[in-house]
């Protein structure tokens, strides 16, 4: 028996369902009574879901997995993973045994888009050219860790005096806080770009300082 899976990682958004595709070519006369199908975590070999002993044995993994029972006899051994979580990320092995056996691994990459950044300024009044200001760009609940870029109004990258911190919350999603310390010019726009490297999603925020009032 030959097992086939997609070579590219499966990218799934947090809280959506993902299908890990796996197929085998059944011989003529194949019946499900002969099938041992096991999905397991590749690294730890922890059972995820199985069809053995003549029946779907159900989920051994958070009760969020399912097979496609009507398609098994055709050789479709794919696994449905519901309400994907950050902790689901990793490699899954599809193991199929009929008379002989084969297995293959498929990677699940979890992702979540970052929110539109909110911008704050400190101090936020009585600003004069030459003042040192702190601009904070905050974006929430993304995954995996973001890449953060700062630019001025002319699109020139600002790399000095930038401090970025990323903290995972209880769901494993990251909140990003990036702080730019800059000396004010006569007027200017400062923009921050938060990029999700997996989704290639960019979230933009900017602040324009033109004396008073400030525009965000």
């Amino acid at each position: 028996v030959e097992v086939q899976v997609s070579e590219d990682p499966v990218v799934a958004l947090v809280d959506t369902d993902a299908t890990l595709r796996c197929s085998f070519s059944p011989e003529p006369g194949f019946s499900l009574a002969q099938l041992n199908l096991i999905w397991q975590l590749t690294d730890t070999k922890q059972l995820v879901h199985s069809f053995t002993e003549g029946r779907d044995q159900g989920s051994a993994y958070s009760n969020r997995t399912a097979l496609f029972p009507d398609l098994l006899v055709q050789g479709n051994a794919s696994l449905r993973l519901q309400r994907v979580r950050v902790t689901d990320e990793g490699s899954y092995t599809c193991f199929v045994s009929i008379q002989d056996f084969d297995s293959a691994a498929v990677s699940l990459q979890v992702a979540a888009p970052y929110s539109k950044p909110s911008m704050t300024l400190e101090p936020n009044k009585d600003l004069r050219p030459g003042n040192m200001v702190t601009i904070t760009c905050s974006s929430y609940q993304g995954y995996p860790e973001a890449e953060v870029f700062w630019k001025d109004g002319q699109g020139v990258p600002l790399t000095g005096n930038v401090t970025t911190s990323q903290m995972a919350n209880e769901r494993g999603l990251f909140d990003v806080h990036s702080v730019l310390r800059v000396v004010l010019g006569a007027n200017g726009t400062y923009s921050c770009l938060v990029r999700n490297p997996v989704l290639q999603q960019d979230a933009h925020g900017s602040v324009t300082i033109t004396g008073q009032p400030l525009t965000f």
Epitope: N36, I38, Q40, T44, K45, Q46, L47, S50, T52, E53, Q57, G58, A60, T93, F95, S97, F101, S103
Partner: antibody, heavy 115, light 106 residues
Framework: QVQLQQPGAELVKPGASVKLSCKAS????????MHWVKQRPGQGLEWIGM????????NYNEKFKSKATLTVDKSSSTAYMQLSSLTSEDSAVYYC????????WGQGTTLTVSS | DIQMTRHPSSLSASMGERVSLTCRAS??????LSWLQQKPDGTIKRLIY???TLDSGVPKRFSGSRSGSDYSLTISSLESEDFADYYC?????????FGGGTKLEI
């Protein structure tokens, strides 16, 4: 005929580890899940976990995840369960059983944890 | 986890008598239940699987049935070798769980 052979007894000291064995014969070892079950003296049966010899896939009762480690040696058709950091609470009879519906059982190994 | 509640915990009966033991499942187990017999020497043997299917070699006086979430093992006419402990085992969902066991005494 299907047979699951287990040593009769093991005596170990508290804090130590022990590796219990279950040698299978009379069937194709790699085709069936092997399960492990605990029975404390005068008590009922408790499911510890299971291992599929061919894939090496394991599934543990949450209660025993940090206590038991299941492995197999396909060449000798033997399943093993290692129990770590032993205390008197681990003194029990440990059974191996084939399949989830328990179609065949070993005779059980009596584990005594005592100094 | 699925709880399997057995009734009774012990039962005194005479040879030739008809007895029934029951296990109640706390959640749906769809008939995925075995009945096991444990002899005083610790030997465990499966009698019934899939709630009502008799294992080969098991005497016909043993039978299994289901009524909703209640699963019963009936011995139609007790013989001396039937005096033992009996357990139900649900294998519908992980972790698999056993009933507390019924001690059948003379």
């Amino acid at each position: 005929q299907v047979q699951l052979q287990q040593p009769g007894a093991e005596l170990v000291k508290p804090g130590a580890s022990v590796k219990l064995s279950c040698k299978a014969s009379g069937y194709t070892f790699t085709n069936y899940w092997m399960h492990w079950v605990k029975q404390r003296p005068g008590q009922g049966l408790e499911w510890i976990g299971m291992i599929h010899p061919n894939s090496g896939s394991t599934n543990y009762n949450e209660k025993f995840k940090s206590k038991a480690t299941l492995t197999v040696d396909k060449s000798s058709s033997t399943a093993y369960m290692q129990l770590s950091s032993l205390t008197s609470e681990d003194s029990a009879v440990y059974y191996c059983a084939r399949r989830g519906d328990g179609d065949y059982w070993g005779q059980g190994t009596t584990l005594t944890v005592s100094s | 986890d699925i709880q399997m509640t057995r009734h009774p915990s012990s039962l005194s009966a005479s040879m030739g008598e008809r007895v029934s033991l029951t296990c109640r499942a706390s959640q749906e187990i769809s008939g995925y239940l075995s009945w096991l017999q444990q002899k005083p020497d610790g030997t465990i043997k499966r009698l019934i699987y899939a709630a009502s299917t008799l294992d080969s070699g098991v005497p016909k006086r043993f039978s299994g049935s289901r009524s909703g979430s209640d699963y019963s093992l009936t011995i139609s006419s007790l013989e001396s070798e039937d005096f033992a402990d009996y357990y139900c085992l649900q294998y519908a969902s992980y972790p698999y769980t056993f009933g507390g066991g019924t001690k059948l005494e003379i």
